[in-house]
């Protein structure tokens, strides 16, 4: 299923513009002497922006109003209405959409699209390539690890290169990368699985410059409002990749009648987008620090952050949790297709396949499922949490702790109606993947209003890092181990294809049970965690005498 | 539905080697475990084995270790049974089978009868 | 191993009810499934399945088969018997390696 790249990135794409940009803000204040200023604008795909006084927030559940934060007997500062009209305030030009960088940001979104699109190809035809090249459960879950592992190692690097180099160039070059690698993959002989291993960790590497490197361009293009719809389309391109690659590889294996085909599929579109961004992005300028930011910057070390972050008990228990949700939905995506089709060879609705295409209708269906409880787990969480927020000041955290509880009985309802039901598991997997993503906005937005606007792209980096680490770069193939193990102390046959794969994936629900207590323990601390960040971002706004106005 | 075609009637010297073939066609769709199975008019149906077509792996009943040895074509989709060291209490009809389900035996071949006489 | 123990033989009239018993020494029930099997065999043919998971009819099976039981007692029932059924009717148990069968049940006419 869709990684948390959705998670953390939606709240902190393009994390260094933003708080280039929350320093600009600043220092327009600071210039006007304004007294204190709060964080004006929207802050990236829907992350809150921190502010200082009883002002509204922006984020992706909606604006929620904060009680004004200072020392007791302190009125609360203006809020970003009366400072942005003060005497010699620079005025935001209108966001207007202009045609050009609309186009950019569509193909860039539809870029995305295509790197999640081919990353699920793969779950798509996974019983495929069992059988092709004769791996057991274990081999065919280490595809989707080493992929993940490589672009986990990768990202960083990207974002790296990212800040120096001709971004649009790296992009171009990442997709025409993993295009190459992917069209070539599917000309492996039998014999040379470990081959496609290595494939997959080559497309990790090239797919990871994108998801690093687009959405700071994106960033770049647009600003407030118009920055917060655009990062929300791109990132919303996650499901909808993850389920068209699911329906991808089942239909054009079923229509060209051999599974080699839909590795061929995303490579030529691959390298349809790679040309379009090399001719219709415009090569953007990173967004410039202020001397304010300046300072901020030279104030605090990367060191400094860390031990910052590490010490951020909401900060680190939303990460946890964020991992959990990553090896769940990492693990369901990559087996639920081939457990369901298992599920009904036991049932005798389908045959045990032996000679592709195999399974193409539970990819097709699966697909199609997530591409929608994608969507609608973000819209859900985000209205709940909203509600919510009137009723208390832990809702974010409670709301991702009720759905990951929620989801987790779900998910333990799959194993029980895929031994009577497809119908029925079909119901349950919708109903729990609904609930297990509905925590995607809102985990961004905890993390920011834990984390000063200087640390947010540190704490997304280390939390997108944390959360393959410890979620989607090991689960599927541990699941494939888990299988492999208790079939061989059973024993191989139908029925025990199905079953030991089912208890394997039971792992998921408790892992899902441990991310709804880290929301739980995030919950406890959330409000003390906000509050110092919101005093910190006041302490860092008061202009510094050394500054010349 | 996949249907299982056996090699015709054996007749074999003891201490000597069979081989019985059984082609699977039909539904793209076939089993991965073909099985073999023995009957007898005093023993009555018992279990050989099965061979994954797929990963090639395969299981014996342990009555059956070492007379037995189940192989697999995947190109040709043909399961093969050896049955090596005759004697006349190998003398029964042999039947390849498709393991599916909750491992039950869903389709059947129509049988070898294998003979061994001197 | 699991050994199923089955009467020898039936002998119904035509039209009447048949029930065939099968005993096995010890519960083939695992993780909600029955794993007992029924397949008839006709004289000079393979075995066909008729039942599996002790009371599901297999394809193409006629309704006036079914199957019953749970943990070590299951019957197969032939209601009402026709003059096709006459064959030698054997259960089988999945659940535990090697896959045993039942000395078989020979159904004939009265």
């Known amino acids: 299923m869709m990684c948390l790249e959705c998670a953390s990135a939606a709240a902190g794409g393009a994390e260094e513009e933003e708080a280039d940009a929350e320093r600009r803000r600043r220092r327009r204040g600071a210039q006007r002497g304004a007294g204190g200023s709060g964080c004006c604008g929207a802050r990236g795909a829907g992350g809150a922006g921190v502010s200082a006084a009883g002002d509204e927030v922006q984020t992706l559940s909606g604006s929620v109003r904060r009680a004004p934060t200072g020392p007791p007997g302190t009125p609360g500062t203006p809020g970003c209405a009366a400072t942005a009209k003060g005497p010699g305030a620079q005025q935001p030009k209108p966001a207007s959409l202009g045609r050009g960088r609309g186009a950019a940001a569509a193909i860039l979104s539809l870029g995305n699209v295509l790197n999640y699109l081919d990353r699920y190809t793969v779950a798509g035809v996974l019983l495929d390539i069992q059988q092709h090249f004769g791996v057991k459960d274990r081999g065919a879950g280490l595809l989707q690890s080493v992929f993940i592992c490589s672009f986990m190692v990768a990202a960083p690097i990207f974002g790296y290169l990212g800040d120096r180099f001709n971004r649009k160039v790296i992009l171009s070059c990442g997709i025409f990368f993993w295009s190459a690698v992917t069209f070539s993959s599917s000309f492996i002989p039998q014999q040379y699985f470990w081959l496609l291993v290595l494939s997959r960790g080559l497309v990790g590497i090239g797919e990871a410059s994108y998801s690093t490197i687009a959405p700071t361009i994106i960033g770049d293009l647009f600003t407030k409002n118009t920055r917060t719809l655009m990062l929300s389309v791109f990132y919303f391109a996650i499901p909808l990749g993850s389920g068209l690659g699911y329906i991808t590889g089942s239909s054009v294996k079923q229509a060209a009648g051999d599974w080699h085909w839909a590795l061929r599929v995303s490579p030529v579109l691959g390298m349809i987008t790679g040309t379009l961004i090399l001719i219709l992005v415009p090569a953007t300028k990173r967004g410039h620090a202020d001397q304010l930011g300046d300072q901020l910057k030279a104030r605090t070390s990367w060191l400094r952050d860390m031990k910052a972050l590490i010490r951020n008990r909401s900060y680190v228990f939303s990460s946890l949790a964020t991992s959990a949700v990553s090896f769940a939905t990492g693990a369901l995506g990559m087996w639920i297709p081939l457990y369901l089709h298992r599920a009904q060879v036991v049932q005798k609705t389908a045959e045990t396949c032996n000679s592709p295409p195999c399974g193409a209708k539970d990819s097709l269906i699966f697909g199609a499922i997530t591409c929608f409880t994608g969507f609608l787990g973000v819209v859900t969480g985000a209205g709940a949490t909203r509600w919510c927020r009137l009723k208390t000041q832990r809702a974010d955290p409670l709301v991702c702790a009720v759905g990951m509880l929620g989801s987790a009985i779900f998910i333990c309802l799959i194993f029980v109606a895929a031994k009577s039901s497809i119908v029925g598991a079909y119901i349950c997997i919708f109903v729990g993947e609904t609930l297990l993503f509905s925590n995607w906005a809102i985990t961004a937005d905890i993390l920011m209003y834990v984390v000063i606007p200087t640390r947010r792209a540190t704490a997304v980096a280390l939390q997108s890092f944390t959360s393959h680490l410890l979620g989607d770069a090991g689960s599927p193939y541990l699941i494939g181990f888990i299988s492999d193990l208790i079939r061989q102390s059973t024993k191989d046959s139908p029925l025990w294809e199905f079953l030991s794969l089912g208890y394997a994936l039971m792992l998921c629900p408790f892992v899902v049970v441990l991310g709804g207590m880290f929301f739980l323990a995030t919950a406890l601390f959330f409000v003390s965690d906000r509050a110092r960040a919101e005093q910190q971002v006041n302490q860092l706004a008061m202009p510094p005498a050394s500054v010349k106005v | 539905q996949v249907q299982l075609q056996q090699s015709g009637v054996e007749l074999a010297k003891p201490g000597s080697s069979v081989k019985i073939s059984c082609k699977a066609s039909?539904?793209?769709?076939?089993?991965?475990?073909i099985t073999w199975i023995k009957q007898t008019p005093g023993q009555g149906l018992e279990y050989i084995g099965y061979?994954?077509?797929?990963?090639?792996?395969?299981y014996y009943n342990e009555k059956f270790k070492g007379k037995a040895t189940l192989t697999a074509d995947k190109s040709s989709s043909t399961a093969f049974m050896q049955l090596s060291s005759l004697t006349p209490d190998d003398s029964a009809v042999y039947f390849c089978a498709s393991l599916t389900g909750v491992d039950y035996f869903d389709d059947w071949g129509q049988g070898v009868m294998v003979t061994v006489s001197s | 191993d699991i050994v199923l123990t089955q009467s020898p033989a039936l002998a119904p009239s035509l039209g009447q009810r048949a029930t065939i018993s099968c005993r096995a020494s010890q519960s083939v029930r695992m993780s909600g499934y029955n794993l007992m099997h029924w397949y008839q065999q006709k004289p000079g043919q393979q075995p066909k399945l008729l039942i599996y998971?002790?009371?599901k009819l297999a394809s193409g099976i006629p309704a006036r088969f079914s199957g019953s039981g749970s943990g070590t007692d299951f019957t197969l029932t032939i209601d009402p018997v026709q003059s096709d059924d006459i064959a030698t009717y054997y259960c089988q148990q999945s659940k535990d390696d090697p896959y045993t069968f039942g000395a078989g049940t020979k159904l004939e006419l009265r």
């Open positions: 061979i994954n077509t797929g990963s090639g792996k395969t």
């Open positions: 039909g539904n793209t769709f076939t089993s991965n475990y």
């Open positions: 998971d002790a009371s």
